[in-house]
């Protein structure tokens, strides 16, 4: 008896649906009381099908009311573990165990990633040196580095601080200044760039007509 | 309340058998993954075999692959362990454990354990 | 699978805070946070302390803590009191789904 994983890594986005496979041999019709399908994730338990059902009650609580396991594709000899709006907690080794007459056990790696595209941006300028002060903040995963360029494609150097975020997901919250003497309508790009993917996300940021004044920190009268 | 009662411990020579059982109560035992761990006398605890729910899946550690056949009785809330060609490093109290629901490792209740003595 | 290492013994008087160590891999303690405390008294079963690195089943003390950094994992026992004399054993899931546990550290309670 031997089961086959077509795939043995899944790269998927958070917030995403994944669904990975594991094949069993099936002679003519399935016997579902005789099917035993056990999904897990390293040390939780993911889901327990026996005796033709899902057993919920071992389920492990990171995993509730988002995975499942098809039942019209057991009968054609797939355990398909589907997991809807995964998380960056979701990524690890999954293992499915089949037994069915005989039993067998695959692994499967489940990688998330988060993309950085939503960049919010702010342009503010110092009146005492007319220095302005571009920022770029987005949230990913996983580090991305933030590279400043000017309209001819210079590159510029800025100032990164990463910091996890604080939302239960923990991504990412990289956030970039750059400092620089501009004028009105000057253009400059912010992309942040995860170096392992190659993957980048790019903001533009126009210098405006009015200066935007820059609150001082501890002013003193 | 959980309660796993092992029996069958003894002496016996090497090369001899021994069947383990481990009597469970207070908990759906068919819903827990189960297993066995020993401790060698003044030594640390060796995870020996786990066993899934259904009975059909099972592990065991490579000391005793081949030598040691972990099973179970849904129906009678009973868990086993036959153990084969034993040697005198199979001495160990042996604990019948129970897995944590949820995860696959983690053990939240044991056995009082029972003695198995090989020796000639 | 190697076990993983913890110091033979540890000692502190009733009222202080004593560390015991849990070193693994880069292949256990280090890859997941799933490492356990198990408390043994002499002749007895051992109990669950801590799970999943610093979670504490209901009914075990808020004395007992765990943490993990790296490839090292830690139980902190603070307030030492008598009844916390005994055998501490550490337990990592390892990436073959089976247990590997710890050497074993005595702890002792002085006075």
């Known amino acids: 008896f031997t089961i086959t994983a077509p795939k043995d890594l899944y790269v998927v986005e958070y917030g995403s649906n994944v669904t990975m496979e594991c094949r069993f041999p099936v002679e003519q019709k399935l016997d579902l009381l005789a099917l035993v399908v056990y999904w897990e994730k390293e040390d939780k338990e993911v889901i327990q099908f026996v005796e033709g059902e899902e057993d919920l009650k071992p389920q492990h609580s990171s995993f509730r009311g988002r995975a499942f396991l098809p039942k019209d594709q057991l009968l054609k000899g797939n355990a398909v573990l589907q997991i809807t709006d995964v998380k960056l907690q979701d990524a690890g080794v999954y293992c499915c165990m089949i037994s069915y007459g005989g039993a067998d056990y695959k692994r499967i790696t489940l990688k998330v990633n988060a993309p950085y595209r939503k960049i919010n941006q702010r342009i503010s300028m110092d009146p005492a040196t007319s220095e302005h002060e571009l920022m770029c903040q987005a949230e990913g995963y996983p580090e991305a580095e933030v590279i400043w360029t000017n309209s001819d494609h210079q590159s510029l150097s800025g100032e990164t601080t990463v910091t996890t975020s604080q939302t239960e997901e923990k991504l990412l919250n990289v956030t970039s200044v750059l400092r620089v003497n501009a004028t009105a309508n000057d253009v400059f790009h912010c992309t942040f760039w995860r170096v392992h993917s190659g993957e980048n996300h790019t903001a533009e940021l126009i210098i405006p007509e009015l200066p935007v004044p820059r609150l001082p920190h501890n002013r003193t009268h | 309340e959980v309660q796993l009662l092992e029996s069958g411990g003894g002496l016996v020579q090497p090369g001899g058998s021994l069947r383990l059982s481990c009597a469970a109560s207070?908990?759906?035992?068919?819903?827990?993954?189960m297993v066995w761990v020993r401790q060698a006398p003044g030594k640390g605890l060796e995870w020996v075999s786990s066993?899934?729910?259904?009975?059909?899946?099972?592990f065991y550690a490579d000391s005793v692959k081949g030598r040691f056949t972990i099973s179970r009785d849904n129906s009678k809330n009973t868990l086993y362990l036959q153990m084969n060609s034993l040697r005198a490093e199979d001495t160990a109290i042996y604990y019948c454990?129970?897995?944590?629901?949820?995860?696959?490792?983690?053990?939240?209740?044991w056995g009082q354990g029972t003695l198995v003595t090989v020796s000639s | 699978q190697s076990a993983l290492t913890q110091p033979a013994s540890v000692s502190g008087s009733p009222g202080q805070s004593i560390t015991i160590s849990c070193t693994g891999t880069?292949?256990?303690?280090?890859?997941?946070?799933?490492v356990s405390w198990y408390q043994q008294h002499p002749g007895k079963a051992p109990k669950l302390m801590i799970y999943?690195?610093?979670n504490r089943p209901s009914g075990v003390s808020n004395r007992f803590s765990g943490s993990k950094s790296g490839n090292t994992a830690s139980l902190t026992i603070s307030g030492l009191q008598a009844e916390d004399e005994a055998d501490y054993y550490c337990?990592?899931?390892?990436?073959?789904?089976?247990?590997?546990f710890g050497t074993g550290t005595k702890v002792t309670v002085l006075g």
């Open positions: 207070g908990f759906t035992f068919s819903s827990y993954l």
């Open positions: 999943d690195v610093s």
């Open positions: 454990a129970r897995i944590k629901l949820g995860t696959v490792t983690t053990v939240d209740y």
């Open positions: 066993i899934y729910p259904s009975g059909g899946i099972t």
């Open positions: 337990s990592s899931y390892t990436s073959s789904s089976t247990r590997v």
């Open positions: 880069s292949s256990d303690v280090g890859a997941y946070n799933y």
